[in-house]
């Protein structure tokens, strides 16, 4: 039961995370005009990965897409790429994990296949979450750098007569959505990987039967290999239980470091 719950919860958490990553990628508020010195402004600027917007105090909002590809900063392109890779991997991971869910029966799919698919989707979710976190963090770093640069030369005077106030940008809502969503996807992926451990068929609970060949004493242990999930291949000193072997749902899952994002 615990494995099914872990897998199901991992799927749901990842689903929420990927939905968040998609939402963050589409949002216009990646960077918003810094209002620290002027909390009320007649013109409010904010920018996303795909377009920049201006909201006037009149309520009128105007958005303009970045219609150039080559003219955009490399960092912005990199962030776009990371977010898209995260979404694509996450979407594939979701598709794979649907078929891997223990509660869904598809033909005569073996548990070993489900375990493999669970692990695959888990890894995809982890990479997807990392892509999102990396993308958002790169953008945040870019903002911090630009913020202090524009603070250093906040006013660029023309002969000391005319002042041009530079618009400073700070973290927008999309960054926080992205960080949380990336973290959730990552946690979901870890949960799927943990669930995979329990999904893999345990060694059969038969007593070892010994066959004595002439001259040599060889013990043949039937069902001695786990599905090659990467977690439980038959290593030396593996104990074969006489009885009371743990059921797949009793496999203990330990808290991951990612549970404390």
């Amino acid at each position: 039961m615990a494995v099914t719950a872990c897998q199901g919860l991992g799927f749901v958490v990842s689903l929420i995370g990927i939905a968040g990553i998609i939402a963050a990628t589409c949002m216009d508020q990646w960077s918003t005009q810094d209002l620290y010195n002027n909390p009320v402004t007649a013109v409010f600027n904010y920018q996303g990965l795909w377009r920049s917007c201006v909201r006037e105090s009149s309520g009128f909002t105007e958005c303009r897409g970045y219609f150039t590809l080559l003219g955009l900063p490399a960092m912005l392109q990199a962030v776009r790429a990371l977010m898209i890779v995260g979404i694509v991997l996450g979407a594939i991971g979701l598709l794979v994990s649907i078929f891997a869910l223990k509660c869904i029966r598809i033909g005569s799919m073996e548990d070993s296949a489900k375990a493999n698919m669970t692990l695959t989707s888990g890894i995809m979710f982890i990479v997807s979450g990392l892509c999102a976190i990396a993308g958002v963090s790169v953008f945040a770093n870019m903002l911090v750098t630009n913020f202090w640069m524009s603070t250093a030369n906040m006013y660029t005077g023309m002969g000391g007569m005319v002042q041009t106030v530079q618009t400073r940008y700070t973290f927008g809502a999309a960054l926080f959505v992205g960080w949380v969503a990336g973290g959730l996807t990552l946690i979901g992926g870890v949960m799927m990987c943990i669930a995979c451990r329990g999904l893999a068929p345990e060694e059969t609970n038969y007593k070892a039967v010994s066959y004595h060949a002439s001259g040599h004493s060889v013990a043949y242990k039937p069902g001695g290999f786990k599905a090659s999930t990467g977690f439980g291949s038959n290593t030396k000193n593996k104990k074969i239980y006489d009885g009371g072997a743990r059921t797949e749902d009793e496999v203990q899952s330990y808290p991951s470091k990612h549970d404390y994002v």
Partner: antibody, heavy 118, light 113 residues
Framework: QIQLVQSGPELKKPGETVKISCKAS????????MNWVRQAPGKGLKWMGW????????TYAEEFKGRFAFSLETSASTAFLQINNLKNEDTATYFC???????????WGQGITLTVSS | DIVMTQSPSSLTVTAGEKVTMSCKSS????????????LTWYQQKPGQPPKLLIY???TRESGVPDRFTGSGSGTDFILTITKVQAEDLAVYYC?????????FGAGTKLELK
């Protein structure tokens, strides 16, 4: 058609309070902010501030903080300007104006003349 | 506060003439976010409320004759009236609508010879 109709002229004594109204018609009142502009006799225009007809949140120019208060009666599509503790220098024409795109004022009230005299 | 300086303070013209009036701001009114200049021009005739002519420095309000043209960017703006007519005699105000408070210029009075 869009109209902003202001109340009639006012004659007040120093220290008194006046409440000027601006009734909007011909459009959805809560979609456009309302600005208040003062024009002293023979002088130029001075922006006093504006009120969001959607949230009711007012924004005042520094010079008009304190004695001046913007308010709304949304059900009646009416904006109000209240001036407390009137002074002689408050004698002016007060306009209400609708805030539209470009942060410009496309429709104006006819103006109300306030005279403060002892 | 952004200070708006209009010049000349008054202008005497003959009908059919081309007129230009200037408006300078102490800070740039250009917003890089949408590449627009937040400057508005109004016309006020005696005993009347102001009338919106131009917004975003160069966008003519609907119903305004095309002889009125707004130009300029950043801190320097111009209102041009080609072939002035008698009905154009009024005071013209420019207004900063980029930063609070939304300050007006002192106005340019257009008079007929």
């Amino acid at each position: 058609q869009i109209q902003l109709v202001q109340s009639g002229p006012e004659l007040k004594k120093p220290g008194e309070t006046v409440k000027i109204s601006c009734k909007a018609s011909g459009y959805t009142f809560t979609k456009y902010g309302m600005n208040w502009v003062r024009q002293a006799p023979g002088k130029g225009l001075k922006w006093m501030g504006w009120i969001s007809t959607n949230t009711g949140e007012p924004t005042y120019a520094e010079e008009f903080k304190g004695r001046f208060a913007f308010s709304l009666e949304t059900s009646a599509s009416t904006a109000f300007l209240q001036i407390n503790n009137l002074k002689n220098e408050d004698t002016a024409t007060y306009f209400c104006a609708r805030l539209v795109r470009g942060n410009s004022f496309d429709f104006w009230g006819q103006g109300i003349t306030l005279t403060v005299s002892s | 506060d952004i200070v708006m300086t209009q010049s000349p303070s008054s202008l005497t013209v003959t009908a059919g003439e081309k007129v230009t009036m200037s408006c300078k701001s102490s800070q740039s009114l250009f917003n890089s976010g949408n590449q627009r200049n937040y400057l508005t021009w109004y016309q006020q005739k005696p005993g009347q409320p102001p009338k919106l002519l131009i917004y975003w420095a160069s966008t003519r309000e609907s119903g305004v004759p095309d002889r009125f043209t707004g130009s300029g960017s950043g801190t320097d703006f111009i209102l041009t009236i080609t072939k002035v007519q008698a009905e154009d005699l009024a005071v013209y105000y420019c207004q900063n609508v980029y930063s609070y408070p939304l300050t007006f210029g002192a106005g340019t009075k257009l008079e007929l010879k």
